[in-house]
């Protein structure tokens, strides 16, 4: 058992039919030492009574909050919490696998430059009783400071049957150099709690794995004259990193027909701009990705030829 | 520590072009390296990440861009002295600082050549004869640290008596090949910068 | 007393289905995942299914993958296998099984796929 | 379907330590937690240990398990004759959750 906050503690239990479970003693948090009784959640049922309270933990209704009272006053509470380990594996029930970039990614995160600042986040079909506690550092034996917001509902989503619902922190390194070469990785800690249940995920990165611009911006298209060809122009987006001749981006140019199933040309460029065929009805895409380090593509900015 | 905004002779940086050969003969080492290895821990998640070159040289400091002077966060306080002539400094204009900067990238340049080469001497005695360092990745190497051209004494390459361990070797190999290529980005970036400047 | 009394075994054609039930007694059977495992006659024991306490997620062998489809009903604590297109491959002794450190096992029922 | 290695057979005389090798991987023994179970013929498989090293209530002393890297074993010190049967180790592989991988199995012979 170990205490998660002021009050809240967590109880890890190994998670099979007929286990024994974990023995737990509550004290109660007062000077009194007579006449003390216990009782769970709303009930009036009394558990027993004295200072201390023994308990078996085996199942969710063994948690909850236990209350000492003494003649009608409540004196102390104590909200135990219930962390699963199934078979040595730490139970995943509140998080869904993203299944992106690999299996069991539960949190992804992402970076638009390399000022330190990051958002990761994360899918859920709970909708209620869930509240989620996010903690980061540079390196986890000398650990260096990261701050992270607060976590916020940030999406949602239908999927089949399901809602499905997104949550996204921003966190900031403390002291960032654009241009250092981590060695170190950047660990986030989010701590999940469903009704009675506790969960733990946990993600190790670098900045600049998961580097993924915005957008160009600017696009914009020059006919030239007596040619289907034009000229396309972009700048480099406000969010990525400077200066631009040191943190360079490499540009994909995509000329898309209006049926997704018409050949696409694409044209790769340092530059920021690019003379390609516009056909009717298609149109004109670019996107970046750091020219020296490939993490990934921006998303798409875009113009119709016409 | 920093580079200033200067405007050298134009086509002053044949390094640039070097660089870019080194970053991408690197990268494709290291996929190499990641397939063949596939059953060693080689992935960036799952290897240490060494710098041979910590302590040794500054080349982050040493080359970093003007307009990152200001952040506080990247100016460390290490100091290191180098010698300051090259053929990359095709003019007289050039700083004192981006002499230092130039330096520091052929001191790293040295210091893995040193390494993959002994590294490579021990793999060609592995009787699996699985991974050999590629000879394209050294001779490009080689063609940056021409390029680069500075004075420096020549340093021997490491021998070792003992029987060579090929699972540490190749685990070695890849520790090294992660962090020759972050350094080799650097590298890039930098050139790229002062190509610009 | 933790009990898995498995019903549904016999003998099928290749590509007919069949349905394996696996009841539970003696324990909370929505809180806790289960899987199906398999025997070939003389052969090694074989993982098949795996489903979540709630039924949310399943996961599959690659051999059969597509073909069977593993579900359960909290209300009635009963673990099924759905088995389609049948091979001849698929003859075995099929086990249910909790999930978790120390896991329960049912007695087995044999499927033979034969024509 | 067989991830896990095992040697098909071992033997040993009453009173002998017997013991099996299981050699997986990165993604199973490397960094999931190892089982091993005993199977007598006719009947489902019995765990005798669990968590690599652990003994559930009710199983002999004399069996004891322990791994290292991507390797597990089992040991039999004091093999008795009641142990003759089938031995599978198991693990998950970490790529997908819940997916158990077994040994090859092995089978024990008492002499």
């Known amino acids: 058992i170990w205490e998660l906050k002021k009050d809240v503690y967590v109880v890890e239990l190994d998670w099979y039919p007929d286990a024994p479970g974990e023995m737990v003693v509550l004290t109660c948090d007062t000077p009194e030492e007579d006449g003390i009784t216990w009782t769970l959640d709303q009930s009036s049922e009394v558990l027993g009574s004295g200072k201390t309270l023994t308990i078996q933990v085996k199942e969710f209704g063994d948690a909850g909050q236990y209350t000492c009272h003494k003649g009608g006053e409540v004196l102390s509470h104590s909200l135990l919490l219930l962390h699963k380990k199934e078979d040595g594996i730490w139970s995943t029930d509140i998080l869904k696998d993203q299944k992106e970039p690999k299996n069991k990614t539960f949190l992804r995160c992402e970076a638009k430059n390399y000022s330190g600042r990051f958002t990761c986040w994360w899918l859920t079909t709970i909708s209620t009783d869930l509240t989620f506690s996010v903690k980061s550092s540079r390196g986890s034996s000398d650990p260096q400071g990261v701050t992270c917001g607060a976590a916020t509902l940030s999406a949602e989503r239908v999927r089949g049957d399901n809602k499905e619902y997104e949550y996204s922190v921003e966190c900031q390194e403390d002291s960032a150099c654009p241009a250092a070469e981590e060695s170190l990785p950047i660990e986030v800690m989010v701590d999940a709690v469903h009704k009675l249940k506790y969960e733990n995920y946990t993600s190790s990165f670098f900045i600049r794995d998961i580097i993924k611009p915005d957008p160009p911006k600017n696009l914009q298209l020059k006919p030239l004259k007596n040619s289907r060809q034009v000229e396309v122009s972009w700048e480099y987006p406000d969010t990525w990193s400077t200066p631009h001749s040191y943190f360079s981006l490499t540009f994909c140019v995509q000329v898309q027909g209006k049926s997704k199933r018409e050949k696409k040309d694409r044209v790769f460029t340092d530059k920021t701009s690019a003379t390609v065929i516009c056909r009717k009805n298609a149109s004109i895409s670019v996107r970046a990705q750091d020219r020296y380090y490939s993490s990934s593509w921006s998303e798409w900015a875009s113009v119709p030829c016409s | 520590r920093n580079l200033p905004v200067a405007t050298p002779d134009p086509g002053m940086f044949p390094c640039l072009h070097h660089s870019q050969n080194l970053l991408r003969a690197v990268s494709n080492m290291l996929q190499k390296a990641r397939q063949t290895l596939e059953f060693y821990p080689c992935t960036s998640e799952e290897i240490d990440h060494e710098d041979i070159t910590k302590d040794k040289t500054s080349t982050v400091e040493a080359c970093l861009p003007l307009e990152l002077t200001k952040n506080e966060s990247c100016l460390n306080s290490r100091e290191t002295s180098f010698i300051t002539n090259g053929s990359c400094l095709a003019s007289r204009k050039t700083s004192f600082m981006m002499a230092l900067c130039l330096s520091s990238i052929y001191e790293d340049l040295k210091m893995y050549q040193v390494e993959f080469k002994t590294m490579n001497a021990k793999l060609l005695m592995d009787p699996k004869r699985q991974i050999f360092l590629d000879q394209n990745m050294l001779a490009v190497i080689d063609e940056l640290m021409q390029a680069l051209n500075f004075n420096s004494e020549t340093v021997p390459q490491k021998s070792s008596l003992e029987e060579p361990d090929f699972y540490k070797t190749k685990i070695k190999l890849c520790i090294l090949l992660h962090a020759f290529r972050i350094r080799a980005v650097t590298i890039d970036r930098v050139m790229s910068y002062l190509n610009a400047s | 007393q933790v009990q898995l009394v498995q019903s549904g075994g016999g003998v099928v054609q290749p590509g007919r289905s069949l349905r394996l039930s696996c009841a539970a007694s003696?324990?909370?059977?929505?809180?806790?995942?289960m899987h199906w495992v398999r025997q070939a006659p003389g052969k090694g024991l074989e993982w098949v299914a795996f489903?979540?306490?709630?039924?949310?997620?399943?996961y599959y062998a690659d051999s059969v993958k597509g073909r069977f489809t593993i579900s359960r009903d909290n209300s009635k604590n009963t673990l099924y296998l759905q088995m389609k297109s049948l091979r001849a491959e698929d003859t075995a002794v099929y086990y249910c099984?909790?999930?978790?450190?120390?896991?329960?096992w049912g007695q087995g029922t044999m499927v033979t796929v034969s024509s | 379907s067989y991830v896990l290695t095992q040697p098909p057979s071992v033997s040993g005389t009453p009173g002998q330590r017997v013991t099996i090798s299981c050699s997986g991987g990165?993604?199973?023994?490397?960094?999931?937690?190892v089982k091993w179970y005993q199977q007598l013929p006719g009947t489902a498989p019995k765990l005798l240990i669990y968590?690599?090293?652990q003994r559930p209530s009710g199983v002999p002393d004399r069996f004891s398990g322990s791994k290292s890297g991507t390797s597990a074993s089992l040991a039999i010190t004091g093999v008795q004759a009641e142990d003759e049967a089938d031995y599978y180790c198991?693990?998950?592989?970490?790529?997908?959750?819940?997916?158990?991988?077994f040994g090859t199995g092995t089978k024990v012979t008492v002499l």
């Open positions: 099984t909790t999930h978790g450190s120390h896991d329960n």
């Open positions: 003696g324990f909370t059977f929505s809180s806790y995942g």
């Open positions: 489903i979540r306490y709630d039924g949310s997620n399943k």
């Open positions: 990165r993604s199973n023994i490397g960094s999931n937690t």
């Open positions: 968590g690599n090293d």
């Open positions: 198991q693990s998950y592989d970490s790529s997908l959750w819940g997916s158990r991988v």
